[in-house]
Interface confidence: medium
């Protein structure tokens, strides 16, 4: 195997596009005067206190005596999580609701993508049918004993063509009933506004997220949700894993809308997603937070990667570049200095849009906590990995340390974590337990040994369901659902029993 944090790692995927697609344009170079330099330096020093230095995360791979996150004595930690640790579980609307055109719901880009791109899948109607069997979901939540339930609202179920006019009454009723039921059970709702199911009409009329018109439309939709549901929702997520929306939706074509090969479109989409998130955060902060007193963030997903040789600086450069180009792409504007990472700006200057100074100011700090997703969607689809000698790693603890170092130790909600099993596995999902124990152990070590401020954990997922490009070939639920059955009973898997015990004991007891 070729040494290094090899190309083919997420963040270096642009090498799979022809170089013709990266057209050259000149950058403006500024000659800074002495006064300007001193002002910039002062601002940087101030910013350093707020954001940490970009590049600090590199220490994790270096042989740095001040940072050794894993040593032999720490391989497993028998301890409890902090008191009031926030235990939860999550689902995505498109993955579990079913009923894709029932009761006035409009089609989403994924409903369309399923029909045009996925073999042997006719629709999500064969899924867990959460839209029909809401009570069964609530019973499953009761069984586990979670503190919160993270779910997403299907935009086209509320507004069939995406435009905020009169809401679809049945859709509104469904989410209102769900929220009321959660509040009644003392389960905190964490609501995601956009988990990839863009109304198809917005794709067809505007080109979807490629068009900045969507920013205001998304803000209108968010405003409606805040108005209708904000009295019961204290935690909001604007967008789930925008990296995958941009990269796989418009780069590889593996996700809806299935466009591929246009690198400029990938980064335009990313740009619009960031601006949409920022607009919604400011909207919530100004108009809703004063009386609803909630928190709002965006879920950012990432892989983790290790150099084959920690003493080789070039390998470490590549690892840092890989993380910066995936997680930093979105985290830097929102949790960092308000702009794209410097390395991305340099390397992708011909296709990466530019934030104005006013926009940088507007983007910066538009998250009340760091919502982090760590799961197979950021690893598994990259079939280039084995070929290119990449040394990927499921080390959630080190990924959390990287976030701590890069973004000045933010409060972190693990907004999605878990692995997957083969579709043939029913309730005896021993691999899922092994993975969950491993991940939870890493989170506990991050909290207790590295002083990382993780305040909550979202196991993914509550139910087996539609798993995007993998459709129904894998399962991620803690509850087994027979998709061919009429009643879609939720049967607790071994992992559900295990997670229930973890929650009850608030960690690992000896």
């Amino acid at each position: 195997m070729k040494p290094g944090c090899a190309a083919g790692s997420p963040g270096n995927e642009w090498i799979f596009f022809s170089t013709d697609e990266i057209t050259t344009r000149y950058r403006n170079t500024m000659s800074n005067g002495g006064l300007q330099r001193s002002v910039i330096l002062s601002a940087l020093i101030l910013l350093r206190a707020v954001t940490g230095f970009s590049g600090d995360g590199r220490a994790i791979w270096s042989k740095n005596p001040n940072f050794t996150p894993v040593n032999e004595s720490q391989l497993f930690l028998y301890d409890t999580f902090p008191k009031n640790f926030f235990w939860g579980i999550g689902t995505g609307a498109l993955q579990v609701e079913g009923s894709w055109k029932k009761d006035g719901k409009g089609p989403s880009i994924w409903d369309h993508f399923i029909h045009t791109h996925l073999k042997n899948v006719s629709s999500t109607n064969g899924s867990s049918d959460s839209y029909i069997f809401l009570e069964k979901d609530l019973s499953a939540l009761d069984f586990i004993g979670v503190s919160f339930y993270q779910f997403s609202i299907s935009w086209p179920r509320l507004f069939p063509d995406g435009i905020v006019t009169v809401a679809n009454a049945k859709g509104l009723q469904y989410y209102s009933t769900l929220l009321d039921a959660l509040v009644l059970r003392n389960i905190e709702p964490i609501v995601t506004l956009y988990h990839w199911d863009l109304p198809l009409a917005l794709q067809e009329k505007y080109g979807g997220w490629k068009n900045d018109t969507i920013i205001d439309i998304f803000n209108d939709y968010a405003t409606y949700c805040f108005q209708m549901f904000g009295d019961r929702v204290k935690y909001w997520i604007t967008i789930h894993n925008p990296y995958l929306v941009a990269w796989h939706g418009y780069g590889t074509g593996m996700h809806a809308p299935g466009e591929k090969g246009n690198l400029a479109a990938v980064y335009t989409v990313g740009h619009n997603l960031i601006k949409a998130h920022s607009k919604v955060w400011h909207n919530y902060n100004t108009h809703f937070r004063p009386h609803q007193k909630g928190w709002l963030s965006i879920t950012l997903g990432s892989h983790w990667i290790e150099p084959n040789r920690s003493e080789n600086t070039m390998d470490i450069f590549k690892c840092q570049q890989s993380m910066v180009s995936v997680l930093g792409w979105f985290a830097n504007p929102i949790h960092g200095d308000g702009d794209y990472p410097e390395g991305m700006r340099k390397k992708l200057f011909s296709v990466l849009p530019i934030f104005s100074e006013a926009e940088k100011h507007e983007m910066r700090g538009t998250a009340d906590f760091f919502a982090f997703s760590f799961g197979p969607n950021n690893f598994k689809p990259l079939n280039t990995m084995a070929k290119m000698g990449q040394n990927v790693s499921l080390n959630l603890r080190e990924a959390l340390n990287w976030i701590k170092l890069e973004y000045n130790n933010p409060r972190i909600l693990i907004a999605e974590n878990g692995w997957f099993t083969d579709s043939r596995v029913k309730t005896e999902d021993t691999t899922a337990i092994y993975m969950m124990k491993n991940f939870l152990s890493q989170v506990l070590q991050a909290i207790r040994l590295d002083e990382i401020r993780v305040f909550g954990y979202t196991a993914w997922s509550l139910l087996d369901g539609f798993e995007w490009q993998d459709a129904y070939t894998i399962r991620r639920g803690l509850f087994y659902v027979d998709f061919n059955s009429k009643q879609k009973e939720r049967k607790p898997k071994s992992s559900a029993h295990y997670y229930k015990q973890i929650i009850r004991e608030n960690g690992f007891s000896l």
Partner: antibody
């Protein structure tokens, strides 16, 4: 304005040690994105990378010359020093000191070069 | 060490000609490749980074392409001031290495 200037002897005898100093201005050697490399070029021949010092004092050396090279820096004086032991006539070359911009650990390139200093090895 | 093989070692072309130089790496280096121009008696100058990105202020007649092991450097229309030796340089792995150079002359 960023500049690098090499200084040192123009003539050294075989078996002696060559010591070259690179004095930089316009940027700081402690800047986490900057490093300095030494590169040489024998008359009429290609460029050959010798060594590099990163901002955190990590060092890297050419495989074939590793045993003869030492690189160090004095941040307060804005200087990088190259030592090369056991000089031989084949080491006659122009020696360049080069700034390497790594853009917060995205290696980007040798963007500013010194004018070079010609060193002749002869008895 | 990664060997960089540049060809041709020298070429002669007329003003306005399209000039192409190739560089082959002994193993895959992704797009971790730069191109430098060195005029007689001068220090080299960075022209292209990451295989295809033009450095600020470099004329658009210069371009680069390729990834993995095979790379190409092109001057779309040769100008008198382009008389120089051109070097490829890999930074995929340490030690850093250069190609043997291609000397471009006017016919």
């Amino acid at each position: 304005q960023v500049t690098l200037k090499e200084s040192g002897p123009v003539l050294v005898k075989p078996t002696e040690t060559l010591t070259l100093t690179c004095t930089v201005s316009g940027f700081s050697l402690s800047n986490p994105r900057m490093g300095v490399s030494w590169i040489r070029q024998p008359p009429g021949k290609a460029l050959e990378w010798l060594t590099h010092i990163f901002s955190n004092d990590e060092k890297s050396y050419s495989t074939s010359l590793k045993s003869r090279l030492t690189i160090s820096k004095d941040t307060s004086k804005s200087q990088v020093v190259l030592s090369m032991t056991n000089m031989d006539p084949v080491d006659t070359a122009t020696y360049y000191c080069v700034r390497v911009d790594t853009l917060n650990y995205h290696y980007y390139g040798m963007d500013v070069w010194g004018q070079g200093t010609t060193v002749t090895v002869s008895s | 060490d990664i060997q960089m093989t540049q060809s041709p070692s020298s070429l002669s072309a007329s003003i306005g000609d399209r000039v192409t130089i190739t560089c082959q790496a002994s193993q895959g280096i992704s797009n971790y490749l730069n191109w430098y121009q060195q005029k007689p008696g001068k220090a080299p100058k960075l022209l292209i980074y990451d295989a295809s990105n033009l450095e600020t202020g470099v004329p658009s007649r210069f371009s680069g392409s390729g990834s993995g092991t095979d790379f190409t450097f092109t001057i779309s229309s040769l100008q008198p001031e382009d008389i120089a030796t051109y070097y490829c340089h890999q930074y995929d792995d340490l030690p850093l290495t250069f190609g043997g150079g291609t000397k471009v002359e006017i016919r």
